[in-house]
Amino acid sequence: AMDLILINSLPLVSDAETSLTCIASGWRPHEPITIGRDFEALMNQHQDPLEVTQDVTREWAKKVVWKREKASKINGAYFCEGRVRGEAIRIRTMKMRQQASFLPATLTMTVDKGDNVNISFKKVLIKEEDAVIYKNGSFIHSVPRHEVPDILEVHLPHAQPQDAGVYSARYIGGNLFTSAFTRLIVRRCEAQKWGPECNHLCTACMNNGVCHEDTGECICPPGFMGRTCEKACELHTFGRTCKERCSGQEGCKSYVFCLPDPYGCSCATGWKGLQCNEACHPGFYGPDCKLRCSCNNGEMCDRFQGCLCSPGWQGLQCEREGIPRMTPKIVDLPDHIEVNSGKFNPICKASGWPLPTNEEMTLVKPDGTVLHPKDFNHTDHFSVAIFTIHRILPPDSGVWVCSVNTVAGMVEKPFNISVKVLPKPLNAPNVIDTGHNFAVINISSEPYFGDGPIKSKKLLYKPVNHYEAWQHIQVTNEIVTLNYLEPRTEYELCVQLVRRGEGGEGHPGPVRRFTTASIGLPPPRGLNLLPKSQTTLNLTWQPIFPSSEDDFYVEVERRSVQKSDQQNIKVPGNLTSVLLNNLHPREQYVVRARVNTKAQGEWSEDLTAWTLSDILPPQPENIKISNITHSSAVISWTILDGYSISSITIRYKVQGKNEDQHVDVKIKNATITQYQLKGLEPETAYQVDIFAENNIGSSNPAFSHELVTLPESQAPADLGGGKMLL
C-alpha cells in the first residue's frame, strides 16, 4: 500500500532554516516522488523552481531546504506527489511568515459534509486597516478596520465539498508575504459515512484518525497504526507501520505531518501548536494533544501513547481485561537474500500477541503482487508463514516486503532479493585424446551464460543409444581424464555448472559426441633407425603376423627435434622397412611406429637418429692427456652431436721424427671418448693429434698436443695437454 508522508518542518517561516520532506514509507515508487508549488491552491505565489534533493537519511525521500536568507520567497502552498502502479497520491501543505498580521488556528481543518464550520485566524498585529479574506487567492470577504476582531472568522454553517480550499487572511495593505493560510478539507460525505454515494458506514477511526470517504479506510495520525488506529507506535515513530523515526533530539518536536486528504496536517502524537513545538498538557495526548485520557483504575496517561495499561488490561481506557496486545515483530529475516532462479520458498516469521494468523501474513513482490502463505505453522511464540514461488526469475529481483497486520498493529520488513541466473557453459567440452578405454577432455567451462561464482563443476557422460542414466564426475581442473570407458563406443558429454546456494545446479551445456577406439595392436618389434644419407633415414622392423583377419598397416610418425616439422607415413603391413626421405642434413629426428587396423594400435617407444652431415666434422673438444706413465697415457675427448661422426683417429709420433713415422689409432665407435696409448718409450716427447671423421671427411686440428712419458721409476703424471702450434 502507498504510504506517503509530507513533513513540513516549521510552517511558520522566520529567519531560520525551513524544509519540506516527502517520504515514501514501506513502498518503492515506480516514478520519482515530486515536490512542487501548489498553484491550484494559490495562483499568485512565487514562481521560482524548487531545489529538490534526495534526503540522504532515508531511501525513498525527497527534500526541499530553504536557507534563512531565502525566507521572503517561501510563502505559499506546496504539494508532494507519489505514484505506484498508476495510482497517484498528492499531499498538500503551506508555509507562511511568522511575522504575518494574522495566524491560523490550525494549518488544516478537516470537516464532514454538512458540518457547521468556523475557520479562524488570530490577530497578532494591530493595524488601522481593513482585514480581507481570500479563498484560493480570490477575494471573498472583508472586515472594516474598526471591526477587526481578535479572532477573525469565516463561518460556514453547512460545509460542502466546494467550500474546501486555502483560506488566507491579511490586512488590505499587505500582500502574499504577510498573509496567513489555513486549508479547509471537506470530506465528500457526512460524518461516519463513506462510499461513492456516501451511504456506507465508517469503522471508528480512533485517536483522531480520519475515515477516507472513498475507501472507508482509516488514515491514522502520526504515532498510531492499525485498521482503526487503535495501536500506539513506539516512541517517536510514525508511518503506516510505525517504522519511520523522528531523528530530532526531542523526537517529533517541530515536525508538522501532512497526510493524504482527508487527513490534512497535524503534529505527531504528544505535540501541539502551529509549529508542533508545544508538549501536551497533563491528561492530554495524541496529535495536536486533542485526545483526553480517561484511564480506568488510575492508569498513567502518556502524552504520546495515551493510557498505559497495567498487565491484564487493554483498550483505549484500559477498559478491557485480557493479555495486552503486542505489536507483531518480524524476526530472523535477513536484509539481503541471494536466490537461484527456479523454485523459491521464502519464510516470514513473526511474534506478537495475538500471534499472527495465516491470513494476517503476506509477502509483497517488487511489482506489488501480494502473495499468501502456502504453508503455515506456529509455536508458542512465533508464527511462521512459508510462501511458494514456483519459478522466480531475475526480473523478480528487488525489494520484497514481509507484511504482518494483526489487531495489535502492523509491521512490514523490506528485504532485498537478488535472483541469479543459473550458469550454463556456452561451449561443448572438447575431446583432446581418446583411447579404447579412456578419453582426455577439456571441459570448456568458460565462458558461461548466467551468474557465478561457480561452486563446482560436473562432467556428465553416457553412451549414446543406451537407456542408461547420465553418469557424472566432479571436476576441479579444466582437463580431466575419463577412465573405464567401453572400446568402440560412442559417448556423449556435457558439463553442468553449480553456483552457490540451494538449487544452484545449472542446466547442462551443449553436448559433444566422441567414439572410443577399438583395443589396439602392439607396436612393431625390432625397430631400428639408421641414417642412410644426408636426407634419409631408414627404419626397419621384424615382420608382423597379425592375429586377426583385419587389414593392417604400419603408421610411422617422424618429427624433427630442431624444427616443428612432423610427418606421418602409412606403410603396407607386409613391408618391414621404410625410407624416411626429404629430410634435412645434420638434423635429429624422433621416430615412432604403431600397427593400425580399424582401431589404432599402441605407439612404440621413441627412436632417435641424425641424418648424415653435409659438412666436415668439428674437431673433438676438451682433449685431455692423463695418467701418463713411462710407457702409456690416457687420452680423452668429447665430440659434438649431429655431425654423423663415425670414427676418431689418434695420430702420434716421437717429436722430431718424420711425418711418415706416425702411428694412427682409428676408433670406429664414435661413442668412445677416451683411449689408452701403450708401448711408448720412457722419457720421450710425443706429438699427438686427434681427428673426427664423418661421411664428408676428417676434421682439421688447429694445434697438436705434447705428451712426455715418465722415466721408468716415476709415478704417473697429468699433462693437461700442453699445446704446440703446428
Epitope: 495510482e87 451511504n199 458506514l201 471508528a204 480512533m206 475507501t215 472507508g216
Partner: antibody, heavy 117, light 113 residues
Framework: QVQLVQSGGGVVQPGRSLRLSCAAS????????MHWVRQAPGKGLEWVAV????????YYADSVKGRFTISRDNSKNMLQLQMNRLRSEDTAVYYC??????????WGQGTVITVSS | DIQMTQSPDSLAVSLGERATINCKSS????????????LAWYQQKPGQPPNLLMY???TRESGVPDRFSGSGSGTDFTLTISSLQAEDVAVYYC?????????FGQGTRLEIK
Amino acid sequence: QVQLVQSGGGVVQPGRSLRLSCAASGLTFSNYAMHWVRQAPGKGLEWVAVISYDGENKYYADSVKGRFTISRDNSKNMLQLQMNRLRSEDTAVYYCATPKGGALEIWGQGTVITVSS
Amino acid sequence: DIQMTQSPDSLAVSLGERATINCKSSQSVLYSANNKNYLAWYQQKPGQPPNLLMYWASTRESGVPDRFSGSGSGTDFTLTISSLQAEDVAVYYCQQYYSAPITFGQGTRLEIK
C-alpha cells in the same frame, strides 16, 4: 483469531418474534460497523441490516424495514437482531459479518431460522 | 438498488482447466475519482458461511490462492480460476458496495466435469 459466534436460531410460527445474537472476540468490536446477511434455502445471499460502530446509525433492507431491529452492546461485544412479525419468506440462514471497506470479511457460522406454522 | 447478474448459473470444468464466472451490474460500480471498482467476490462451500476472495474487483484477500484472479471494470466483471482444484467446488457470488444497500449476484455453482 477474530471470531463471530452466533446463537438464537430455531423454528418459529409466522407473526411471532425471535432474537438473534452474535458474540465477537479477537477484535475491538466497538470500532466496527456490523452487518446481518441472510440466505434462504437453496437461494443466494441477501443483505438485511447494518449498524454503525457506536450504534447511532442503522439501515435496513426494504424487505425487513419496520419489523427487524439491529442493535449492539459494545460493553459485551454483542450484536443483536430482533425479528418481529416473522413471515415464511424470512426462513433462512442468518449470518452476522464485519466489513472490510464495503466487502464482508469475517462471517459468523450462521444460524437457521425456520418460520413455519 | 444496483442489480447484480451472474452467468452462468452453473458451470462444470475439468480438474486443472480454467474456470470463468461473469458478473454484470445494472449500473457502473467504477468510481472515477479513484478509478476503483467497488466489487467483491465470495466463495461459499456447502454448510459454511461465504468466504471473501476478492475486493476492489481484483485485489486478492489474504490467504486466497493465486490461481484466483478478478478482472473487469464498470459493469462487467470476471472471476477466473486458472487451474481448477477439487477444493474449488463451491458457489461463487459477486457483490457490489458502490452504493447501499450492498447487493449480491444470484450465485454460480461450480462443479467438476
